[in-house]
Each structure stands twice: as C-alpha cells, then as structure tokens.
C-alpha cells in the first residue's frame, strides 16, 4: 500500500518549470510517497523538455540524499531510437524503472523497502548526442518508510560499584515509545535517549540501576505495532559476577 501525499499548494505535484525564450524544462514529482518497510513503493517522475522529437541517446538517473551530488541508486541508458532503457545501475538490485523515458516518464519502483531507504530521491535525465542537455529535479520526492517496532539490541552491562544497567535499542517509524518492566519496576519509561544523529529511526532506553534479580522486559510500541524482548539478571550472591 503506497500513499502519495497531496500538497494542496502545488496540487499533488511539485512542478518545477524552468523556461526562457528558447527552452522549457519541467519536472513533476510528488512531495512525498509513503510505504511500509518490506513493501514496494513507486516514485513518480515525469518531465517536459524543449527538444522536440528528441530521439537520441539518453540516460535516466535517480540519486538519493541531495540533488546533483548525492549517490546514484539507479541509472539506465537508451540508445538512439530505442525505447528500451538498459539498466546500468540498480543499488542492491531493488530499483527498477517503471516509466518510459522516451515518453517523458522516469518513474521508479523500489522493492523490499527498509527504514534506511527513508530519504529524498531526485530524478534526472540526460540527452547525449546532437542535443546535449540535462535536467534534474531539485526538490525531489521524499520517500517516507514506516515500520512496526523491532528491538535490535537488549543487553545488561556492568556499571560502577558492582551495579548493572540495562539497555534496549529499537527501531521503527514512527519512532517507537520504549518501556521497561521488571522486578520492583512496574512500567518505567526509563531514561529514553532521543534518536542518535544519522540513526533517526533508532531509540534507546536505559535502566540505570538494576536492583533486583529477575526478568527485565523492554517493550517498543508505535502506531503500527509492538515488540518486546527480555533479559534475565542473576547475580551470584557474595561474588561480584552476574549471569544474564
């Protein structure tokens, strides 16, 4: 299930029209496309250009992150007169051109979405041959990937003075709320760290001091679901060691 966000001010699409007396390039992309992790998404992109009936070699490119300089995730090339755009690059084999660049359509399908795919994408077309021109969407389309929570790490670590602390890290979009439960705890939100820079979908919660032996459970929840994982703390009394 893929949702395309409607931007009322631009009437569904970001339309970038650039014209001068001799030329007119425009590119149409939606501001945002939403899809769930594991599913596929389509990034629509259509364009117009000033070179009437252009039939020469062309290259279609999609890049991520930033326009002009971001890394390419997809590239294909069509020979003169050909409607087939031969894929030269498809990052991890998950990107596939749906549109026909000869018909001014660069729409791209992204398979097996992961949270790491949540970023902005920019379509680009290059004409090569007698006509020598190129154009790239400058605003791009934001791919918003949603995901139910998943606990990626849960652990007990030693802390000063023979004490122990527990850490729980989960990912999800929207970022999940984390709660700890365990002996003498009830339910505790326990020092939730905000998502780390560059890891926008990761949330960590810490239990700074584990005072009782037993089972400690971390629960991660967002609007798409919940997940839980447990660790066990058992200290050898009279010794400084612990078993988890």
């Amino acid at each position: 299930f893929v949702r395309t966000k409607i931007d009322t001010t631009e009437n569904l699409l970001n339309t970038e029209v650039h014209s001068s007396p001799a030329q007119r390039w425009s590119m149409q992309v939606p501001p945002e496309v939403s899809a769930e992790a594991g599913d596929a998404a389509v990034l629509p992109c259509t364009f117009t250009h000033p070179h009437r009936h252009y039939d020469g070699p062309l290259t279609a490119i999609w890049r991520a992150g930033e326009p002009y300089a971001g890394p390419q995730v997809f590239r294909c090339a069509a020979a003169r007169g050909s409607e087939l755009c031969q894929t030269a690059l498809s990052l991890h084999g998950r990107f596939r051109l749906l549109g026909n660049p000869r018909r001014n359509d660069l729409s791209l399908r992204v398979e097996r979405l992961a949270l790491a795919d949540d970023r902005r994408y920019f379509c680009r077309v290059e004409f090569a041959g007698d006509v020598h021109d190129r154009y790239e969407s400058r605003h791009g389309v934001r791919l918003h990937v949603t995901a139910a929570p998943r606990i990626v790490n849960i652990s007990v670590l030693p802390s000063p003075a023979h004490a122990f602390r527990a850490l729980c890290t989960a990912e999800g979009e929207p970022p999940p709320a984390l709660a700890w439960s365990g002996p003498a705890l009830g339910n505790s939100l326990a020092a939730v760290r905000s998502p780390r820079e560059g890891h926008g979908h990761l949330v960590t919660a810490e239990l700074p001091a584990l005072t009782h032996d037993g089972r400690y459970t971390c629960t991660a929840a967002n609007s798409l679901g919940r997940s839980e994982a447990s660790v066990y703390l058992f200290r050898f009394h009279g010794a400084s060691g612990a078993s988890t």
Epitope: P57, T59, A77, G129, R134, R138
Partner: antibody
Framework: EVQLVESDGGLVQPGRSLKLSCAAS????????LAWVRQAPTKGLEWVAS????????YYRDSVKGRFTISRDNAKSTLSLQMDSLRSEDTATYYC???????????WGQGTLVTVSS | DIVMTQTPLSLSVTPGASASISCRSS???????????VFWYLQKPGRSPRLLIY???NLASGVPDRFRGSGSETDFTLKISRVEAEDVGIYYC?????????FGSGTKLEIK
Amino acid sequence: EVQLVESDGGLVQPGRSLKLSCAASGFTFSDYYLAWVRQAPTKGLEWVASVSYQGITNYYRDSVKGRFTISRDNAKSTLSLQMDSLRSEDTATYYCARQDWEGGFAYWGQGTLVTVSS
Amino acid sequence: DIVMTQTPLSLSVTPGASASISCRSSKSLLHSPGLTYVFWYLQKPGRSPRLLIYRVSNLASGVPDRFRGSGSETDFTLKISRVEAEDVGIYYCGQLLENPFTFGSGTKLEIK
C-alpha cells in the same frame, strides 16, 4: 580520497600514435562522466574529450575528432585516450578530470606531458 | 562555441588587500533558475588546476570563504578578500553548459 593518476606521456613523432591512461580511485567510478583537458606549454586550459558513464557516448573538440578516441573500463576504473595522427599542436600536458556536470571538473590528475616533435 | 573572456590578464595585489577577476561569456550560461554552468579554477605554479567555485557562487570543498563568486547570465566575478601569498597562480573561469566546454584565457595573480 579521490585520486586520478595519469600514465607517463612522452616524446612522439608527428603522425604517430600514443595512448594515455588514467587510474581512478576513491569514488564510484561509473557514477561520473570523465574528461581529458590539455594545456599547451605556457597556454591556457583546453577541453579535449568527455565520456559518459558506461562509455556509450563520447564528445570531442573539433580539432581532435577522428584522431583521438576516449574510452573507459569501469571494471578497472581506468580512463584512456588513444591519440592517433598526432600533430605538433597536440603538444601539451594532458590532465584527466572527473566531470561532475553541475559540479564542474571537480577533480584533476597530476597531468602528463605529451611532446609531438620530429 | 561559447567564448569565455577574462579580465584582467594579470594583477598584482598587496597581501591583505582584495582582488577581483571578471569573466564574460558570449552566451548566457543560465540553464534554468538556480542552475548556471559557470565554474572557477585555480592553477598554482607547477600544479594541476583545482576547482574553487561551482555554479557561480558555491564554494568547492576545502576552499576558504575568502573566495566569493557572483554574477548571472553572461557576467561573472571572482572576488578574493584578504589575499594571501598562497593565492598566487592562474585563475580560470569555465563553462559546462555546451559542448565544446570552454575556459577563459586565465588571469595571473601575483603578490606585490
């Protein structure tokens, strides 16, 4: 770190051939156009040729068309310039450069001197 | 072909002073709003050229903000404030709008 390293040029007689190569590292080679730019002794910069991502499309300045051939090997991250029917006016330092379109000739090799003389 | 005309051919500047180099193209280098294919390069003595400024006014990586590019359409300027000894060399403007890609003839900057 982006690096472009040209092979040695040398002295060649008019009408003869020479092949230059350029080894690239530090970036995704096939994601960029590449170019050769030359500079005659005590003169300015002159673009010679460019090659597209997969080597499908090549561009040349008029004075070298039909004599020079630019090519690339993406598997080996190398750029080449085959120069045939060399003329004295081709004497120059030849630089390979990464052509970033909206980013200009963003990175340059150290250059290699080609002297065409009898 | 697009002709890039640079002025002056050379200039001699006192350290700490400002320097200005002009570049005029024979055709507008504006492709579309916000996208003008003009670039500035510096070639220090005995070295390869180095990109200084891309798309009129954007500073390339590692270039100090004493360098500033400006202009539009056909008229472009590179301004160097607080010139230092390490700024000596030949400055070139260039265009990547149309094949053949062309450069200006260069401006030699010397320190007084």
